[in-house]
């Protein structure tokens, strides 16, 4: 059957933890991505931002996991209105910001 939202979110959090704590060199060679609003629809927005990073094996699993949270297909170059299109940040900071937001959602019991 389908994976419960809380389990899927836990797995995503644990993957993001792995990424943030296992950095031995700049994540994705210091690639920059669009910052996003961490609000409703953030999973699709996060995927839209990260999918533009190619050739970075460290975040491939995260990209796959985010696609499971996003109801529509996302492809490179696609952007929604959820992006703060004037701000680019390093992938490492993007991942840490996303991780913190997801941890807070989990603390509040908001799994969906």
């Amino acid at each position: 059957g389908p994976v419960p939202p809380s389990t899927a979110l836990r797995e995503l959090i644990e993957e993001l933890v792995n990424i943030t704590q296992n950095q031995k060199a700049p994540l994705c060679n210091g690639s920059m991505v669009w910052s996003i609003n961490l609000t409703a629809g953030m999973y699709c927005a996060a995927l839209e931002s990260l999918i533009n990073v190619s050739g970075c094996s460290a975040i491939e699993k995260t990209q796959r996991m985010l696609s499971g949270f996003c109801p529509h297909k996302v492809s490179a170059g696609q952007f929604s209105s959820l992006h703060v299109r004037d701000t680019k940040i390093e992938v490492a900071q993007f991942v840490k910001d996303l991780l913190l937001h997801l941890k807070k959602l989990f603390r509040e019991g908001r799994f969906n």
Partner: antibody
Framework: QVELVESGGGLVQPGGSLRLSCAAS????????INWVRQAPGKGLEWVSG????????LYADSVKGRFTISRDNSKNTLYLQMNSLRAEDTAVYYC???????????????WGQGTLVTVSS | SYELTQPPSVSVAPGQTARISCSGD??????VSWYQQKPGQAPVLVIY???DRPSGIPERFSGSNSGNTATLTISGTQAEDEADYYC??????????FGGGTKLTVLG
Amino acid sequence: QVELVESGGGLVQPGGSLRLSCAASGFTFNSYWINWVRQAPGKGLEWVSGIAYDSSNTLYADSVKGRFTISRDNSKNTLYLQMNSLRAEDTAVYYCARGLGAFHWDMQPDYWGQGTLVTVSS
Amino acid sequence: SYELTQPPSVSVAPGQTARISCSGDNIGGTFVSWYQQKPGQAPVLVIYDDNDRPSGIPERFSGSNSGNTATLTISGTQAEDEADYYCGTWDMVTNNVFGGGTKLTVLG
């Protein structure tokens, strides 16, 4: 308000055993990771052990692994630490400390009890 | 195992800014908490998730964390801020880990 009250400390001989308890109130006990942290006299903080909200995960510092056992009874809102084969270096104030959330990645303490002193000496 | 390093002591004049550092390998990849401990008392959380303040903690306390160093900043330090301060974080290998502590002295 969040309250954590430790008990069970005292004087014990090397090689002896002691069981600490921590009574929790003021929050939903079964939704949080809980830790034991100790502080030797005049020294810094040392994390000892922690347990997930549902007891599904228990973790220990290398210094106590195999000698200490953490457990919890969510029906009684109580945390325990069974300490066996005690050594002089285990002498410390033992604090019960709630984690920020339910899981290991949120185990960093937010609220602390006042502590209970364990003295291991002959 | 993961280690956090703090200066043993920091001194500051009343009303000035105190900065306490906490260094560790890629500490910026973790979330740092800061605890205040006064003699004979239990630690009190003053900063968590790098720069969030629990309710009841004065705005003069703030935190930052990037690279290999996290910093606790106390702006307009008051006499009542004199205490030991510990940084702490969670690491996948060591689990909860604390720095050795920094004694903050408010001069005068």
